[in-house]
Interface confidence: medium
Amino acid sequence: ELCDDDPPEIPHATFKAMAYKEGTMLNCECKRGFRRIKSGSLYMLCTGNSSHSSWDNQCQCTSSATRNTTKQVTPQPEEQKERKTTEMQSPMQPVDQASLPGHCREPPPWENEATERIYHFVVGQMVYYQCVQGYRALHRGPAESVCKMTHGKTRWTQPQLICTGEMETSQFPGEEKPQASPEGRPESETSCLVTTTDFQIQTEMAATMETSIFTTEYQ
């Protein structure tokens, strides 16, 4: 059973599945200037039996400007664009779902694929969240979401994660350690609280940095 919605969006976070349940579909999307080859697959499908799962179909892209079919080549890592599903910075996750039966691993890239992969998940799929680079995770609980079926409808559980813009590397004068490590904050948190007098904010009603009013008549 396909999940009706996408996993929840967490501001400044990205999600990744460690592995994909059988029945998961991955759109064959091509980057700008390229298109699927004629009669090429619309999607890849995770299929398998009790002992082995793999992706059926292959995605292939060709230049929009030419009618020739390009051969499928796996690009070198430096050629690969960041993707929503592969932006996770840390390989360490609570569960290695790839070792579970009935799951496919992340499919290899194909030549000229789009920069973002679009998956169609099935019930039981778990995805893990992590803050994008430059943001620190403030956990309240599990940073994961599972697609569940309840009362005949699918829904994703809400990941307990907030990403803050305070970077661990930022250092301002007057910085001091937080006085407590209260509930809702990981004990391993080591970044400092910033309290400083040299960071000022001024507001002005302006279109530019000059103090002038910028108004637009309502159409």
Partner: antibody, heavy 105, light 107 residues
Framework: PGSSVKVSCKAS????????ISWVRQAPGQGLEWMGG????????NYAQKFQGRVTITADKSTSTAYMELSSLRSEDTAVYYC???????????WGQGTTVTVSS | DIQMTQSPSSVSASVGDRVTITCRAS??????LAWYQQKPGKAPKLLIY???SLQSGVPSRFSGSGSGTDFTLTISSLQPEDFATYYC?????????FGGGTEVLIK
């Protein structure tokens, strides 16, 4: 009424891009109301449902300035508009002095 | 949205009094609560973050406590400069929401 206003918020002396900037307004004699916020380094803004479609929050990293534009102004938008450095769990620790916007016909 | 309900809306007190302000969240917000002080014509000032952590430079007569849905700001011995309006704010989930405010008045 019906026009738009754009309020700017310039930060100095800190790492502007790394922190969320929240916009909070306060109508005369009323409490504080969060309108939305942005983390400049990331660029994506979040808005309160009440203002969705009417407010646009942007940031210019090169000038360490955040902007809040409110359109289709009505008299009830008369308020003081504040920007603040928003550190999430650690609260809004640095505030602008506020900009008074008066909507009148 | 998470609603934050503050009580009382105003309190009259004298210098040296102990003042307690409560804030209730419509759902659990763990420790994601801050308190602010605002004086007329001025921007709010952060007093306490994470329920009970005192912001740098804030006098120790201010303290915060609570967890889950019920929180308290206490001023142990009210000083003349403490007459102001106080707001609680949750940052547990978007949209961020503030309490309605509690005005501390001179008796």
């Amino acid at each position: 009424p019906g026009s738009s206003v754009k309020v700017s918020c310039k930060a100095s002396g800190g790492t502007f891009s790394s922190y969320a900037i929240s916009w909070v307004r306060q109508a005369p004699g009323q409490g504080l109301e969060w309108m939305g916020g942005i983390i400049p380094i990331f660029g994506t803004a979040n808005y309160a449902q009440k203002f969705q479609g009417r407010v646009t929050i942007t940031a210019d990293k090169s000038t360490s300035t955040a902007y809040m534009e409110l359109s289709s102004l009505r008299s009830e938008d008369t308020a003081v508009y504040y920007c603040a450095r928003d550190k999430g769990y650690y609260g809004m620790d640095v505030w602008g002095q506020g900009t008074t916007v008066t909507v009148s016909s | 949205d998470i609603q934050m309900t503050q009580s009382p809306s105003s309190v009259s007190a004298s210098v040296g009094d102990r003042v307690t302000i409560t804030c209730r969240a419509s759902q659990g917000i763990s420790s994601w609560l801050a308190w602010y002080q605002q004086k007329p014509g001025k921007a709010p000032k952060l007093l306490i973050y994470a329920v009970s952590s005192l912001q740098s430079g804030v006098p120790s007569r201010f303290s915060g406590s609570g967890s889950g849905t019920d929180f308290t700001l206490t001023i142990s011995s009210l000083q003349p400069e403490d007459f102001a309006t106080y707001y609680c704010q949750q940052s547990y989930s978007l949209p961020l929401t503030f309490g309605g405010g509690t005005e501390v008045l001179i008796k």
